[in-house]
């Protein structure tokens, strides 16, 4: 049952998805949204906030293999602590070994999500794209 | 409303997307879900068919503008009627002006889908990943 | 495969004139027909297309403005392009082209021979 | 219309030489570039299509690049059979347009 499913298989069910604001898109019962204004790291969380969201946070490969087909580059909710030199996530959560391949493109303490579970490192007061997740229970 | 929201607003209401097949993407009632293995453009449209699907057809910019950011190639269900010279889908539908650039790369007469609005013609023998759809009531 | 042209020469201003270019050895029915023109000592300039099968579809260039006009004969695997209130403007080369392939209508590697049109009084 | 604006309208060059010959369009095409060569007194030849692709049967010293406005014609030693006028075409859209054209011409 992955997004990429490797043999053709007639869905045992027919599901709803959500609940998820108006016009995201909804996905294993987790809501996305990529907004094109760009935005710093720090304005992008606020407005993920205000729409009671969080900048994306990737937990898992399986549950979130849509990432996969992201193209360009967008913020997620992933910062570098410089007194550990953990990544975490905006939950206070450190980033699991194996789930993103982080590249150091810049020096910064923020992350930009790309395509194939990437996080490519930058400057947080850059301007980006973004994406908001929330969540549901 | 749009995938990619200009301005920052609170959604005014949380709401369910579908009917779906289990784990398929939901996206203003659209179902959409890309399978990674490759089949040639026949054997595509039968995979869709066979989960009550069909290949994708894209109709609007507007409520699909989740396609914008979408990575790679993969076959839609757009095929080319060599008799009349025209691009129609799957249901008889002939293509509309303006929604995708046609873009002459292959000698074929089938499409794929490539990301912001991009049809790539393609000889229809070729194996390509796929996206298929279900169009929600 | 070869585009074969006809019916150029010398025209009064004001005139009208029918250049005519066959297909052969290829499927006439289920590929486009482009129109473009030189003039002497000018770059290309496109004129419009039409399929040669049953839709007879057509695109124009945004300056003909109806005094040109494209027709086919399925039966011929003719492309026909009417010039009308020929001005010295349009003296040219007229090419006619065709698609690579039957599904494209933008990308031309089948050329006719051209054809001279001259508008003088 | 898009207008497509090609540089230089016209070079000077020896045999052996790199040539390259650039083409802008006037908003983002997604590589649906041509490039033609003519002799005079002949019609236009097909040379590269969708931006890179050789067309069959053309010397492999051609090459096409670019991506959005802006693609680049080169050819790696410039050879006595290549002097003529190369045109770049736009074939994202109708209407089809042409560049001015670029003469290349012996040194």
């Known amino acids: 049952n992955s997004l990429f499913n490797q043999e053709v298989q007639i869905p045992l069910t027919e599901s709803y998805c959500g609940p998820c604001p108006k016009n995201w898109i909804c996905y294993k019962n987790n809501c996305y949204q990529f907004f094109n204004e760009s935005k710093n790291w720090y304005e992008s969380q606020a407005s993920c906030m205000s729409q009671n969201a969080s900048l994306l946070k990737v937990y898992s490969k399986e549950d979130q293999d849509l990432l996969k087909l992201v193209k360009s580059y967008h913020w997620m909710g992933l910062v570098h602590i410089p007194t550990n030199g953990s990544w975490q996530w905006e939950d206070g959560s450190i980033l699991s070994p194996n789930l993103l391949t982080i590249i150091e493109m810049q020096k910064g303490d923020c992350a930009l999500y790309a395509s194939s579970f990437k996080g490519y490192i930058e400057n947080c007061s850059i301007p980006n794209t973004y994406i908001c997740m929330q969540r549901t229970v | 409303n749009s995938l990619f929201n200009q301005e920052v607003q609170i959604p005014l209401t949380e709401s369910y997307c579908g009917p779906c097949p289990k784990n398929w993407i939901c996206y203003k009632n659209n179902c959409y879900q890309f399978f990674n293995e490759s089949k040639n453009w026949y054997e595509s449209q039968a995979s869709c068919m066979s989960q009550n699907a069909s290949l994708l057809k894209v109709y609007s910019k507007e409520d699909q503008d989740l396609l914008k950011l979408v990575k790679s190639y993969h076959w839609m269900g757009l095929v080319h009627i060599p008799t009349n010279g025209s691009w129609q889908w799957e249901d008889g539908s002939i293509l509309s002006p303006n929604l995708l650039t046609i873009i002459e790369m292959q000698k074929g007469d089938c499409a794929l889908y490539a990301s912001s609005f991009k049809g790539y013609i393609e000889n229809c023998s070729i194996p390509n990943t796929y996206i298929c759809m279900q169009r929600t009531v | 495969q070869q585009l074969e042209q006809s019916g150029g020469g010398l025209v009064t201003p004001g005139g009208s004139l029918k250049l005519c270019c066959i297909g052969s050895g290829f499927d006439f029915n289920t590929y486009w027909m482009t129109w473009v023109r030189q003039a002497p000592g000018k770059g290309l300039e496109w004129i419009g297309c039409?399929?040669?099968?049953?839709?007879?579809?057509?695109y124009y260039a945004s300056w003909v403005n109806g005094r040109f006009t494209l027709s086919r004969d399925i039966d011929q695997s003719t492309g026909c392009l009417q010039v009308n209130s020929l001005t010295a403007a349009d003296t040219a080369m007229y090419y006619c082209a065709r698609p690579g392939y039957r599904s494209w209508s933008k990308t031309f590697d089948l050329w006719g021979q051209g054809t001279m049109v001259t508008v003088s009084s | 219309d898009i207008q497509m604006t090609q540089s230089p309208s016209s070079l000077s060059a020896s045999v052996g030489d790199r040539v390259t010959i650039t083409c802008r369009a006037s908003?983002?095409?997604?590589?649906?570039l041509n490039w033609y060569q003519q002799k005079p007194g002949k019609a236009p030849k097909l040379l590269i299509y969708a931006a890179s692709s050789l067309q069959s049967g053309v010397p492999s010293r051609f090459s096409g690049s670019g991506s959005g406005t802006d693609y680049t014609l080169t050819i790696s030693s410039l050879q006595p059979e290549d002097f003529a006028t190369y045109y770049c075409?736009?074939?994202?859209?109708?209407?089809?347009?042409f560049g001015g054209g670029t003469k290349v011409e012996i040194k």
């Open positions: 908003q983002d095409i997604s590589e649906s």
């Open positions: 075409q736009q074939a994202n859209s109708f209407p089809l347009t």
């Open positions: 039409i399929h040669g099968g049953s839709s007879g579809s057509t």
